[in-house]
Every structure is written in structure tokens, then in C-alpha cells.
């Protein structure tokens, strides 16, 4: 149904080996990044923290889908993860490697 | 071509009458809101200020489009416009009505 397909956070496990980042990220081998999936139909729900522009764009799309594209379901808040990585050949620990995992999705 | 279809800001004129907002926005009759259109294919261009998560998601999508959706082209910076509007029956002028017009797009 439309509600089930609405913008929300869904699981997305990233295996660093699969994307070739295991060459510089030593640990962890992967992590739960999540992704934002689903539609942003008008009216946009409050928990999706839409901007005024997103509300207007969704409304225009509703009235004329040729004139404007839908607002898009994207990460609005990202969290860091901790990693062990190679920096100029030195194994380095970074407690907060920012912007890696989705904590909130919204319509933009 | 792919480059021509890449994430960028495109014109989108909003007529307040068309979306029913003329009931409370007295002036202007409309404005250039712009919208963000186009694809976010890996590698994501620097001017699209991709987050690490967006880069990873685009890379996963490139390798397996079933596993992750593409990163999305969305407004990353919004500008205000000036409006005359009705606030509890009082005609009010607001120099900076925030979040109305796209000034920059990016991949998220």
C-alpha cells in the first residue's frame, strides 16, 4: 500500500570488501549504513521534517506531475561510526568517522 | 547524454494561485523556486557536496542496483523570499520567509 511505501529508513548493510574500501579500512569489515527509501507524496508527514520548498514541490507534483518532480526521500541526519584505518601506512583509530549511517530520513 | 542529465538546479516557477496559497499569501503572485533534477551516479562530483553515506550508497548501487537505490538529487541550500501574507487576519510583511527557493543542489 501507499503508506507502506512511504519514505522511511530501511536496512542497508555495507561490506567494505564489496566496495573496495577494505584496502584502507581495517575494521570493522562492514556496518549497518541504512538507506532512505519510499515516496514523498503530498501531504508530507511532519516526522519527515519537510522544508517549505519540499511541501510546495510535492503539491505542484500532485497537481501536475510534468511540471515538478516529487520531493525525494533522503537522509536528514547521519551518525558516525568508529573505524580502524590506514593513514600513510599507519594503522589509526578514529572514534567518530562522521556521516556514515542514516539515523533519520525526510522529504527534501 | 549522462552529463546533461546530471544533478543540477532547474527552473520551477511557483504560482501561488495554482497551489491554493493565494488565500494567505497576498504578494508576490508567485516566485522562482527552482528544483533539483537529474541523477546522482558514481563517482559523485565534488560540487554536489556528497556525504560519505551518499558516496557509499552510489557505489553500492553501481555494483548492485538491487541492493541500494541511487543517491538522490535534492536541495542542499535554500534561500528566503519576501512575502506579504495574512497572519490571523493581519496583513504582514516578512522580508525573509525562509526555505522557499533552491540555491544549491547536491547528492544525498
Amino acid at each position: 500500500n501507499a503508506k507502506g511505501n512511504y519514505c522511511k529508513r530501511t536496512p542497508l548493510y555495507i561490506d567494505f570488501k564489496e566496495i573496495g574500501w577494505d584496502s584502507w579500512i581495517i575494521a570493522p569489515p562492514g556496518y549497518e549504513a541504512y538507506e532512505c527509501r519510499g515516496v514523498c507524496n503530498y501531504p508530507l508527514a511532519e516526522h519527515l521534517t519537510p522544508t517549505k520548498h519540499a511541501i510546495i514541490q510535492a503539491l505542484v507534483h500532485l497537481k501536475n506531475s510534468q511540471k515538478a518532480s516529487k520531493a525525494c526521500c533522503v537522509p536528514t541526519k547521519l551518525e558516525p561510526i568508529s573505524i580502524l584505518y590506514l593513514d600513510k601506512g599507519v594503522v589509526t583509530y578514529k572514534f567518530k568517522y562522521e556521516g556514515m549511517a542514516v539515523s533519520e530520513c525526510g522529504c527534501r | 547524454n549522462a552529463k546533461g542529465n546530471y544533478c543540477k538546479r532547474t527552473p520551477l516557477y511557483i504560482d501561488f494561485k495554482e497551489i491554493g496559497w493565494d488565500s494567505w499569501i497576498i504578494a508576490p503572485p508567485g516566485y522562482e523556486a527552482y528544483e533539483c533534477r537529474g541523477v546522482c551516479n558514481y563517482p559523485l562530483a565534488e560540487h554536489l557536496t556528497p556525504t560519505k553515506h551518499a558516496i557509499i550508497q552510489a557505489l553500492v548501487h553501481l555494483k548492485n542496483s538491487q541492493k541500494a537505490s541511487k543517491a538522490c538529487c535534492v536541495p542542499t541550500k535554500l534561500e528566503p523570499i519576501s512575502i506579504l501574507y495574512l497572519d490571523k487576519g493581519v496583513v504582514t510583511y516578512k522580508f525573509k520567509y525562509e526555505g522557499m527557493a533552491v540555491s544549491e543542489c547536491g547528492c544525498r
Partner: antibody, heavy 115, light 111 residues
Framework: QVQLQESGPDLVQPSQTLDITCTVS????????VHWVRQPPGKGLEWMGT???????DYNSAFKDRLAISRDTSKNEVFLKMDSLQTDDTAVYFC?????????WGQGILVTVSS | QFALIQSDSMSTSAGSTVKLSCKRS????????VYWYQQHEGRSPTTMIY?????PDGVPDRFSGSIDSSSNSAFLTINDVQIEDEAVYFC??????????FGGGTKLTVL
């Protein structure tokens, strides 16, 4: 610093068209709004129209369909075009910047409509 | 469509207080903010009061704005009137039709 400068003809023949340019400096037309206001000799101020920062335009309905306002943001210019001028259109024409309030005015240009 | 009605002229003496009025013909004076402009002979106007009672930087605190709903009028009060206050004063408000409406102006003479 902020400046607005009107330029155009001093004299226009009746039934002809008036073209005035307001050249601005020290601010962006996508941030600030620009009013056109006129003042007949010895009389009051009359709002003609506004070029809004978002690109929308409003007109005083008293000028019906004979007024057109436009802009070129790359050149920092706002244009006023008014058709079918009559002698009672003789006035000083001002452009003015509207931010939180009208904080800067041009010096005005006196346009006389006469044959 | 309403009009803003101002008396054509007023005289006052230096050092006194003067109150210029701006009456709204129809509708409530409080239903939109009133702005006041000063215009010296041969010069461009300058804003003295905006949003009803706010003064732009550089405007002396001798100038103040107010409204009175019983007379459906806005007022510009000038305390300790100076010679340089001699000018024409215009009020302005908003409407949903003609978006920016000016009063006819009051010529203030300082004796």
C-alpha cells in the same frame, strides 16, 4: 555602498512609451525587493509596482495593462516600461529598495509628458 | 479598497510636540502595519517608522508611531520638534488589492 540610480528620458511625447532603468549596486536583486514609486509635481507618492526578490512581480491595478516591470539580475538592473503615456503621467519616478523596510531610494528622475 | 487620509498641512513651533494622523477610510487600521516616511523639499523620502512603531537606525527617538483603534487612525508623534523636521510626512499601509497604499501626505511647517 548601497545605491539605486534611475535613468531614462526627461521628456516623452503623449501616447508614447516610457522606459526607465534602475541600476543598483551594493546589494543583490535576488535578496532585496525593488519598488517603483512615482510622485507628480506637488503631489503625493503612488506605488506603481514591485519586483520581488523571488522573481514575482506585483502591479498597482491603477496602471491596468500598460505597466511592465522586469529585471536582469546579472546586470543588477530593474526596468519599468509604461505604455500610452498622458500628460498626467508627468512625475518624478523613483526606484526604492525594500528590505525589512524601504531603506534606500534612488534620487528620482523627472519625466515630463508633453508634445 | 481603502484610502489613508492625512490632513494637508500642519503648523507647529520648534520645541513643541506634534501628532500627525493617518485615518483608514474602511477596514481596521490594526489589520496591517503602518509605515511613515519623511520627504524634504526636492529630496527622496526616508523611512521614519516601520512595522507601526519601529525606528530605523539613525532616526531620532523623538519620532514614534502608534495606532488608535477608536479613531481607526495611525499617528506619528514628533517630540521636541526641530527646524529640520519641516517636511512632508506620508503614511503607508498594505492591502490585498493595491498592495502598498500611501496617504496623501501632511506638510509640516515649523514656525
Amino acid at each position: 555602498q548601497v545605491q539605486l540610480q534611475e535613468s531614462g528620458p526627461d521628456l516623452v511625447q503623449p501616447s508614447q512609451t516610457l522606459d526607465i532603468t534602475c541600476t543598483v549596486s551594493g546589494f543583490s536583486l535576488t535578496t532585496y525587493n525593488v519598488h517603483w514609486v512615482r510622485q507628480p509635481p506637488g503631489k503625493g507618492l503612488e506605488w506603481m509596482g514591485t519586483m520581488w526578490n523571488g522573481g514575482g512581480i506585483d502591479y498597482n491595478s491603477a496602471f491596468k495593462d500598460r505597466l511592465a516591470i522586469s529585471r536582469d539580475t546579472s546586470k543588477n538592473e530593474v526596468f519599468l516600461k509604461m505604455d500610452s503615456l498622458q500628460t498626467d503621467d508627468t512625475a518624478v519616478y523613483f526606484c526604492a529598495r525594500l528590505g525589512y523596510y524601504v531603506d534606500y531610494w534612488g534620487q528620482g528622475i523627472l519625466v515630463t509628458v508633453s508634445s | 479598497q481603502f484610502a489613508l487620509i492625512q490632513s494637508d498641512s500642519m503648523s507647529t513651533s520648534a520645541g513643541s510636540t506634534v501628532k500627525l494622523s493617518c485615518k483608514r477610510s474602511t477596514g481596521n487600521i490594526g489589520s496591517s502595519y503602518v509605515y511613515w516616511y519623511q520627504q524634504h523639499e526636492g529630496r527622496s523620502p526616508t523611512t521614519m517608522i516601520y512595522d507601526g512603531d519601529k525606528r530605523p537606525d539613525g532616526v531620532p527617538d523623538r519620532f514614534s508611531g502608534s495606532i488608535d483603534s477608536s479613531s481607526n487612525s495611525a499617528f506619528l508623534t514628533i517630540n521636541d520638534v526641530q527646524i529640520e523636521d519641516e517636511a512632508v510626512y506620508f503614511c503607508q499601509s498594505f492591502s490585498s488589492g493595491i498592495k502598498f497604499i500611501f496617504g496623501g501626505g501632511t506638510k509640516l511647517t515649523v514656525l
